[in-house]
Amino acid sequence: EEELQVIQPDKSVLVAAGETATLRCTATSLIPVGPIQWFRGAGPGRELIYNQKEGHFPRVTTVSDLTKRNNMDFSIRIGNITPADAGTYYCVKFRKGSPDDVEFKSGAGTELSVRAKPSAPVVSGPAARATPQHTVSFTCESHGFSPRDITLKWFKNGNELSDFQTNVDPVGESVSYSIHSTAKVVLTREDVHSQVICEVAHVTLQGDPLRGTANLSETIRVPPTLEVTQQPVRAENQVNVTCQVRKFYPQRLQLTWLENGNVSRTETASTVTENKDGTYNWMSWLLVNVSAHRDDVKLTCQVEHDGQPAVSKSHDLKVSAHPKEQGSNTAAENTGSNERNIY
């Protein structure tokens, strides 16, 4: 007569994380007498997966009815599979012994591979803002995927980037893997509305890659350009001086007017106008009563943008040609919060 064989027909089984794995096993005979048990791994360190007699195995169910007579189907199902369940599973026939059962024959084993989706990529940029023409680094991380093969791409506004380095860890066998990539991006003045995208493609995603994004508005600082101009005379003894603050980002900006080096007024940018490229413009003006001055006045527009060192632009106001008017030292004209009379 033929000796009992333990048949595991599937050399490998591939299951998506969260699903149920079916591990098939049949015996060719009911004898010798003794139980079947399931293990993960071989040798002394193997892990008991299912023993019908003893233990609590809440995720394991038998394929065949436990009350079925003369059952030779010892297949099991393992529910809610995670990457940690990956490994080779053995269906093992024991011969009844006293006091302990003795291993009689093992199946060839079924390798369970778990397909686990990568987590949503998280893209992070530099801690501090940088100005155009500078190169900044972005990192992208995704975790928990299996198998190890994965593809990562970087894009800036839909254009694929080439300057990046990617690592998948660990290097050896593992239940799941992580990917880490660093891309270098050169900033331009037009990048306020730009996006950097990290795209991850994996077999579990069925051709629909995961994307993580970073807005360059969180990274870029576009310093302003300043222009101070003298407007046509509004009244015979008044001059309007404007400071145009153009193309700056972010909005955080403080402007100080200096008259011959002395602080005249400080204000914070509020009602700014936004340009198409996402940068801002702002204008401040100063109403100067030239009749109060005997000498030329040096007006300076000083701007502190986003906590950076101040930049300034000066304008020399000529006053010699203006005759002094009666009472002008008492009746100053104020036409707005951004105006200033000089006596």
Partner: antibody, heavy 119, light 108 residues
Framework: VQLVESGGGVVQPGGSLRLSCAAS????????MTWVRQAPGEGLEWVST??????YYADSVKGRFTISRDNSKNTLYLQMNSLRAEDTAVYYC???????????????WGLGTRVTVSS | EIVLTQSPATLSVSPGERATFSCRAS??????LAWYQQRPGQAPRLLIY???IRETGIPERFSGSGSGTEFTLTITSLQSEDFAVYYC??????????FGGGTKVEIK
């Protein structure tokens, strides 16, 4: 399924007997087989079970009784040596049925053969 | 060894009445318990296995219940052929297979 025991009789203490059980109606070589005995006026007592090469005995008969099978003849045997008065009983041959992946109960029984150990 | 204790030892019941008797195991045997009927002068006959599964051909009036250490065999309406001795047997932990001492159901 039919199980027919034979070989019982009267034997003196210390003597030997060989019981046989002829099986038919099922695939004999695929199943474990068991001997169960019942002393006069008493309950059932498991004696021995055989699988393929694996054999199991009650402590009360270990070393004295030997269970065996001949699959080519569809026959189960129980060789009983060093018989004692307390071995007096009706000996039943039973076919094992397995459930729960490892447990055995007895779904078919023979009519039994009587063994009397007496001087 | 697992000891099975059956009670009562004898049960006197009138035909048509309900008979219930128990089998208590000295340790947990899960559902690995069988019941047998033995009529006078006959071989035992399997009635129930896995604590509650009726063997093919066994009338519906026989039912098994329980798990762990407490088991019950119930005959809902006793017929004349049901007067016999009933044995329980555990197959959870063996050798040895063990039988209870039996419950004799006799006519009242």
């Amino acid at each position: 399924v039919q199980l027919v025991e034979s070989g019982g009789g009267v034997v003196q203490p210390g003597g030997s007997l060989r019981l046989s059980c002829a099986a038919s109606g099922f695939s004999f070589s695929n199943f474990a087989m068991t001997w169960v005995r019942q002393a006069p006026g008493e309950g059932l007592e498991w004696v021995s079970t055989i699988g393929s090469g694996d054999t199991y005995y009650a402590d009360s008969v270990k070393g004295r009784f030997t269970i065996s099978r001949d699959n080519s003849k569809n026959t189960l045997y129980l060789q009983m040596n060093s018989l004692r008065a307390e071995d007096t009983a009706v000996y039943y041959c039973a076919k094992d049925s397995t459930v729960s992946w490892s447990g055995d109960f007895f779904d078919y029984w023979g009519l039994g053969t009587r063994v009397t150990v007496s001087s | 060894e697992i000891v099975l204790t059956q009670s009562p030892a004898t049960l006197s019941v009138s035909p048509g009445e309900r008979a219930t008797f128990s089998c208590r195991a000295s340790q947990n045997v899960k559902n690995d318990l069988a019941w047998y009927q033995q009529r006078p002068g006959q071989a035992p006959r399997l009635l129930i296995y896995a604590a509650r599964i009726r063997e093919t051909g066994i009338p519906e009036r026989f039912s098994g219940s329980g798990s762990g250490t407490e088991f019950t065999l119930t005959i809902t309406s006793l017929q004349s052929e049901d007067f016999a001795v009933y044995y329980c047997q555990q197959y959870y932990d063996w050798p040895p297979f063990t039988f209870g001492g039996g419950t004799k159901v006799e006519i009242k």
